[in-house]
């Protein structure tokens, strides 16, 4: 978590002199409670906005906006503490609006906003606005919190941000997967404009289940410059397991900007449609069925063969 660097942070507006300060997230009013404290924020809204740094990089930011309640407690409002908590890492970043003049009665409702917290693609946050001074230990809370989920890099607006581009968001492999026969799968995709290797991860599933019945990994060496943006095709050999017919193909690139953490793209081939008329049940049922293989997973001694070509 960090603040966008691109200009001096301002919170002043007509009728209010205000300065933005870094905060330890532990306001002095926690330690030295006051007798009279303001009421809580109203209508807290968090939206995804985008902002450029001085260097011209584009980042997603949390746009935080709230209003004041129309009560006399605005006379005791000395500022606000804005806190962004990343839920998974428990990392917190705070800033403080410090009012340098007293708020006066106003024809319109007082409204505040702040758009300088940089957020990460796909991450989850809790945003809190505390009015200051904070209440005495048994006082009514004077803060409001909202959760905020940042879309991942597949989202159209996110795709062009600097963090997403660094993880390969502009590469569209346009994957096509075709079942050639019960034992072969053909995968076609478009190479990116970088001499880097790729990995194809194949995971197969039974028709209605989410637990894999076959897994295979295939390495594609780095293409030469003349092969950039060209289609590459690979034929993967499947394990002939009855009912193991739904195949998910995932392509993992290893671009220099993101290494092992690049965005992966996937495509799925569904099982063939079942015929509408059920097969007739035989007059007798066999006592056992022949075994169709001892292991569900591909091991080192039993690799699926595959070959690949780059097309110009």
């Amino acid at each position: 978590l960090r603040l966008l660097d691109h200009r001096a942070l301002v919170c002043s507006q007509p009728g209010l002199n205000c300065t933005v300060k870094n905060s330890t997230c532990l306001d002095d009013s926690w330690i030295h409670p006051r007798n009279l404290t303001p009421s809580s924020p109203k209508d807290l809204q968090i939206q995804l906005h985008f902002a450029h740094t001085q260097q011209g990089d584009l980042f997603p930011v949390a746009h935080i906006e709230w209003t004041l309640q129309t009560d006399a407690s605005i006379l005791y409002l000395e500022g606000a503490e804005l806190s962004v908590l990343q839920l998974n890492t428990n990392e917190r970043l705070c800033v403080k609006f410090q009012f340098l003049s007293m708020l006066q009665h106003h024809r319109k409702r007082w409204r505040f906003s702040f758009s300088h917290f940089v957020v990460d693609p796909g991450q989850e946050y809790e945003v809190t606005v505390h009015h200051l001074p904070k209440p005495i230990p048994d006082g009514d809370p004077n803060h409001q919190s909202k959760n905020f989920l940042v879309p991942d890099c597949e989202h159209a607006r996110m795709k062009v941000t600097t963090p997403c581009m660094s993880s390969g968001s502009l590469w569209d492999p346009n994957i096509t997967v075709e079942t050639l026969d019960t034992q072969h799968l053909r995968v076609d995709f478009t190479l990116w404009n970088e001499s880097t290797h790729y990995q194809i991860l194949l995971t197969s599933f039974p028709h209605m289940e989410n637990h894999s019945c076959f897994e295979h990994m295939h390495h594609i060496p780095a293409p030469r410059p003349e092969e950039f943006h060209q289609r590459s095709n690979v034929t993967l050999t499947l394990r002939n397991l009855k009912g193991c017919c739904r195949h998910q193909v995932q392509i993992q690139p290893f671009f220099s900007s993101c290494l092992n953490d690049c965005l992966r793209h996937s495509a799925t081939v569904s099982c063939p449609e079942m015929p509408d008329t059920p097969e007739p049940i035989p007059d007798y049922m066999p006592l056992w069925e022949p075994r169709s293989g001892s292991s569900d997973y591909k091991d080192d001694d039993d690799k699926g063969s595959s070959h690949h070509h780059h097309h110009h």
Partner: antibody, heavy 116, light 107 residues
């Protein structure tokens, strides 16, 4: 391929405890939180809480506070949910799911039956 | 806590037709809404989050419209695999809460 695989069905007596496991694969457990949601037979979904494997931080629904404990073991990429003082109305399918707000991958569910 | 109300409880639609499912929040949740699909004996599957962003691999026939308190999930042309129960969920504030579900069945 992200997968969350849960432990098998359990039958428990009222007053007992149950501990359900959820093994994550296809991603790093510490990259996302794990949430727990339950579903009573023929009913809707009920959020129980979440744990961050990265920080160990937890948030529990008030209803389960003091009765539930969520933990993780990063060495085995496994999350656990323990529910104590079981009652008959705790009979449900218990799901683990990845993330803390919009839950993008779910385990297959573990049926916990509480019956005397 | 925020109460999520879904309607109708059951929706009968023919394959190829449009299905419209409604979800109402007891207070404004901005766009902090997710939709899930659940088939019998299976776990829920995330369809949409942020009230309009489709999750990975979800076809374009699923879309959401709304913000604040009123949301609508639209399935533009129902396929055989779309007959299931659909739940909405708010993640605006704790605790996370789900709607009671809408069952979409074949007419």
């Amino acid at each position: 391929q992200v997968q969350l695989v849960q432990s098998g069905a359990e039958v428990k007596k009222p007053g007992a405890s149950v501990k359900v496991s959820c093994k994550a694969s296809g991603y790093t457990l510490t990259s996302y939180g794990i949430s727990w949601v339950r579903q009573a037979p023929g009913q809707g979904l009920e959020w129980m809480g979440w744990i961050s494997a990265y920080s160990g931080n937890t948030k529990y629904a008030q209803k389960f506070q003091g009765r539930v404990t969520m933990t993780t073991d990063t060495s085995t990429s496994t999350a656990y949910m323990e529910l104590r003082s079981l009652r008959s109305d705790d009979t449900a399918v218990y799901y683990c799911a990845r993330r803390q707000l919009a839950l993008d991958y779910w385990g297959q569910g573990t049926l916990v039956t509480v019956s005397s | 806590e925020i109460v999520m109300t879904q309607s109708p409880a059951t929706l009968s639609v023919s394959p190829g037709e449009r299905a419209t499912l409604s979800c109402r929040a007891s207070q404004s949740i901005s766009s902090n809404l997710a939709w899930y699909q659940q088939k019998p004996g299976q776990a829920p599957r995330l369809l949409i989050y942020g009230a309009s962003t489709r999750a990975t691999g979800i076809p374009a026939r699923f879309s959401d419209n709304g913000s604040g308190t009123e949301f609508t999930l639209t399935i533009s042309s129902l396929q055989s695999e779309d007959f299931a129960v659909y739940f909405c969920q708010q993640y605006d504030t704790w605790p996370l809460t789900f709607g009671g579900g809408t069952k979409v069945e074949i007419k």
